[in-house]
């Protein structure tokens, strides 16, 4: 009896759908795995054979849900289907966006750039997805423990009247609010203001 | 929400020739990768062809050389047109896209496209 793959799981990211599992202990030496997945009453083959224990579902639709299996050979056995269900375009996990800032006296200007769909040539974005797309900003000043958020309107934003020759920083993440879904947090940048530009009287 | 409405079905004598309309709504059109799926009855829905949004198509074998898939990103609207056919050729005819999509994949399964039409009957007669 051939043993079923084990902590089978989707791994998604901007769309980019990897099924993953684990071999399970098996004796008699060392197993395949086929992977498929459900296309209109019948199941079609992904991964054939692999020795792998992933295999890359990204081209299926973002809108519906998957049924995906797996299953472990060995010569002339198998062992029985392990199943799960997907929804892309809820189940995705959301990647940090980019981020650019720069300093301008005592103010950091930041524009904020969408993650990528995964393996698409064009340069359609989450955003473009999800219409309710917006960005959380955090900012704190460095060495501080105390966090400020705001949610910018727009693909920029920009924190004014900051302590001069101080250092501040800053992460974005993706947020649906019809969804009440976070993506991941960028990693944070850090920039230091230089002076208050306004002019004494 | 992405809706698509199929057109130009109709019956024909084998040798015939009819072209098949799908007219999209809710997305940029531009960015869509659509198809053409047909299930006869009794059987399973197969791709028949397909078209990226980069304008790169691809065709089943069993109509190549007969069928010609194209769209019209101004009028919103994808075709399929079919000549020299055949009473295999008998089916409901579906419309297929999926939003947000290059040609990165080279979709002709139905499991890889997200929004469906409502079909159009195609009935060749020998």
């Known amino acids: 009896m051939v043993p079923p793959p084990e902590n089978v799981r989707m791994n998604s990211v901007n769309f980019k759908n990897i099924l993953q599992w684990e071999s399970p202990a098996f004796a008699k030496g060392n197993l395949t795995f086929t992977a498929q997945y459900l296309s209109y009453r019948i199941f079609q083959d992904k991964c054939m054979n692999t020795t792998l224990t992933e295999c890359d579902f990204s081209s299926l639709s973002k809108y519906g849900d998957h049924t995906l299996r797996v299953r472990a050979e060995f010569a002339d056995e198998h062992s029985d289907w392990v199943n799960i269900t997907f929804c892309p375009v809820d189940d995705t996990i959301i990647g940090p966006p980019g981020m650019q800032v720069e300093v301008l006296a005592d103010s950091l200007h930041m524009r904020f750039l969408a993650p990528k769909i995964e393996n698409e040539y064009e340069t359609w974005t989450m955003k473009n997805v999800y219409n309710s797309w917006t960005y959380n900003v955090q900012y704190w000043k460095n060495g501080t423990d105390e966090k400020f958020q705001i949610t910018p309107q727009y693909d920029f934003e920009v924190l004014r009247n900051l302590e001069p020759w101080t250092t501040y920083c800053v992460q974005v993440r993706g947020f649906l609010p019809d969804r009440n879904k976070a993506g991941e947090w960028s990693e944070p940048v850090c920039e230091q203001t230089t002076h208050d530009e306004t002019v004494p009287s | 929400q992405v809706q698509l409405q199929e057109s130009g079905g109709g019956s024909v004598q084998a040798g015939g020739s009819l072209r098949l309309s799908c007219a999209a709504s809710?997305?940029?059109?531009?960015?869509?990768?659509m198809g053409w799926f047909r299930q006869a009855p009794g059987k399973e829905r197969e791709g028949v062809a397909a078209i990226d949004s980069d304008g790169s198509t691809r065709y089943a074998d069993s109509v190549k050389g007969r069928f010609t898939i194209s769209k019209d990103n101004a009028k919103n609207t994808l075709y399929l047109q079919m000549n020299s056919l055949k009473p295999e050729d008998t089916a409901m005819y579906y419309c297929?896209?999926?939003?947000?999509?290059?040609?990165?994949?080279?979709?002709?399964?139905?499991?890889?496209?997200?929004?469906w039409g409502q079909g159009t009957q195609v009935t060749v007669s020998s």
């Open positions: 297929a896209a999926e939003p947000y999509c290059s040609g990165g994949y080279k979709r002709t399964m139905v499991a890889e496209f997200g929004y």
């Open positions: 809710g997305y940029t059109y531009s960015s869509y990768c």
